[in-house]
């Protein structure tokens, strides 16, 4: 997360006293890992084995749609920005369970754990461009008739990625590994040294631009959308209500804990209690923010399920009608089925 | 009383090999590691090496190549050997321990060995 | 590796003044478990090093309390509070929180 916030369970008696007691071996390894670390790891390997195969299956569904449906272009990069993040788990686990000795090196340090930032400013940003189209379809059906294209539907994917590797760069810049004296342990962590103000710089803008700004955003955006959709007799469903809302919660929901210890291990003090009792729950606050990554094709399966009654059709089948179905803009006031229901299919990322 | 004493020779000739032994008195070498640190006039205080308790061993990345420390606990030995010394390792040579690992910094030195590389 | 540097090189003080040396590392010596592997030795002519401070600010055993530590993350003091003759000598600061360990070069209190 941001410094070097990891413990040492390994030699857990070698540092709690001030005398000398030479009788006492201090280098006796306990493989006890920390219940919050158990927890970490119990999540990974869920998130590994839904996200990996999940996000397969609707990277696989949408790429083949993806030339001419405009939802398969944003499902497609919602899946593939959580399927990269999934790969880096088995480091992240192993990382874990070695009571967070890194010995992958330096750049696999720089690069593994980035890739769950470049995850989530991804997915906030494809989550807000998908939102934006949700937006347009509702309130300028005009506009969209003459200019939403895959080509434009594109270039804002690529803008999104674009702005997201650029945000991850600070972390990725700053991290490091450190290999720690005693007990002998490589860690992979950020390192600002001397520059505590940019350590903060860094936690604000995170918290700003990947959490509290897009929860602005998309709360007034999907305010709006529900209340246009919902006064439409067509289109009144608490159903959809209730999968809109589920959906663009999660996101928040799932990154809130990371958010919230990240921007506080900023403003503390490496060595005081609370920093240290924060970094204890490091690993179970990143274990849940990769939630995200498996999230989506659950929802995609859910609300498939729930919308179309499609309970009999093959996985690919009901993912394929679910993530492809095209929006249609009519002239009259009231949207087709089909556009609320795709709209109501996570409409959001990670 | 914790005690550690060294042993080894005062001139070395260049490209030849260094052997010093550090005998402890008073803790186990099961249990505690041991360092080696260095001092000459141009590079100040050195840290060479380290042989914990189980018998790890960890080195300076700038010296790894010509270090070698092992030991003997039943006769309370540690053995620091260097090949190809040139003129620039002339040294004072310290084994130390932190015994409580680094709580206490190099808590307990030798006596040290003045090592001279010189045809 | 972390680069220890002490300030300043020599210090002349009068006996029974307080004398005060700084040193400061090139990267935060917090370890994982929260503790500051910062130490402070001193090394009179002839002789051995001998740890004065351990941890940023312990005593070690037998260190008169005149010799006091203080400091956090990359910044660290050393202070004696009345400086006697028994004090000379050369004081040096290490960290062993990183691999490899490593000490400062040394400042040289001498009588003023």
């Known amino acids: 997360m941001n410094s070097f916030n990891y413990t040492t369970p390994d030699y857990g008696h070698y540092d709690d006293k001030d005398t000398l007691d030479l009788n006492t071996p201090v280098d006796k390894t306990s493989n006890t890992l920390r219940v919050p670390d158990i927890l970490a790891l119990v999540i990974f390997a869920v998130v590994f084995l839904v996200g990996v195969l999940g996000n397969a299956l609707v990277v696989w569904v949408t790429a083949f749609e993806a030339k001419r449906t405009i939802n398969a272009i944003w499902f497609l990069n919602l899946a593939v920005a959580d399927f990269l993040s999934c790969l880096a788990l088995p480091i992240l686990f192993t990382s874990i369970v070695q009571h967070h000795h890194w010995p992958f090196g330096g750049a696999a340090c720089s690069i593994l754990p980035s890739l769950i930032l470049l995850n989530m400013y991804a997915s906030i940003l494809l989550l807000a461009t998908i939102s934006a189209d949700r937006f347009l379809l509702v309130f300028k059906p005009i506009w969209c008739q003459n200019f939403r294209g895959a080509g434009l539907a594109w270039i804002a994917c690529a803008v999104a990625w674009g702005l997201a590797l650029l945000l991850t760069i600070p972390s990725f810049l700053y991290r490091v590994v450190r290999e720690e004296y005693f007990p002998p342990k490589v860690l992979c962590g950020v390192d600002y040294s001397h520059d505590k103000r940019r350590e903060r710089a860094v936690a604000i803008v995170r918290l700003v631009l990947g959490f509290l700004w897009p929860l602005l955003t998309l709360t007034i955006c999907y305010t709006f959308i529900l209340l246009r959709t919902w006064s439409r007799r067509a289109t009144r469903s608490t159903k959809t209500l209730k999968v809109v809302v589920a959906v663009v919660a999660s996101f928040f929901i799932f990154w809130l804990p990371y958010q919230v210890t990240g921007i506080m291990m900023s403003f503390l003090e490496p060595s005081s209690p609370t920093f240290l009792l924060l970094n204890k729950l490091d690993s179970l606050c990143v274990s849940f923010a990769y939630i995200n990554c498996c999230i989506n094709p659950i929802i995609y399966v859910v609300a498939g399920q729930g919308f179309q009654g499609r309970l009999r059709k093959s996985l690919p089948s009901l993912l394929r009608n679910v993530l492809t179905e095209e929006s249609v803009v009519r002239e009259s006031k009231s949207f087709t089925r089909s556009t609320v229901d795709t709209m109501a299919q996570k409409t959001q990322a990670v | 009383q914790v005690q550690l004493k060294q042993s080894g020779p005062g001139l070395v000739a260049p490209s030849q090999s260094l052997s010093i032994t550090c005998t402890v008195s008073g803790f186990s070498l099961t249990n505690y590691g041991v360092d080696w640190v260095r001092q000459s006039p141009g590079k100040g205080l050195e840290w060479l090496g380290v042989i914990w308790g189980d018998g790890i061993t960890k080195y300076n990345s700038a010296l790894k190549s010509r270090l070698s420390i092992s030991k003997d606990n039943s006769k309370s030995q540690v053995f620091l050997k260097m090949n190809s010394l040139q003129t620039d390792d002339t040294a004072m040579y310290y084994c130390?321990?932190?015994?409580?690992?680094?709580?206490?910094?190099?808590?307990?030195w030798g006596q040290g060995t003045l090592v001279t590389v010189s045809a | 590796d972390v680069v220890m540097t002490q300030t300043p090189l020599s210090l002349p003080v009068s006996l029974g003044n307080q004398a005060s040396i700084s040193c400061r590392s090139s990267q935060r010596l917090v370890h994982s478990n929260g503790n500051t592997y910062l130490h402070w030795y001193l090394q009179k002519p002839g002789q051995s090093p001998k740890l004065l401070i351990y941890?940023?600010?312990n005593r070690f055993s037998g260190v008169p309390d005149r010799f006091s530590g203080s400091g956090s993350g990359t910044d660290f003091t050393l202070k004696i509070s009345r400086v006697e003759a028994e004090d000379l000598g050369i004081y040096f600061c290490a960290q062993s929180t990183l691999v490899p360990p490593t000490f400062g070069g040394g400042t040289k209190l001498e009588i003023k």
């Open positions: 941890k940023v600010f």
């Open positions: 130390a321990s932190a015994l409580d690992y680094s709580n206490y910094g190099f808590a307990y």
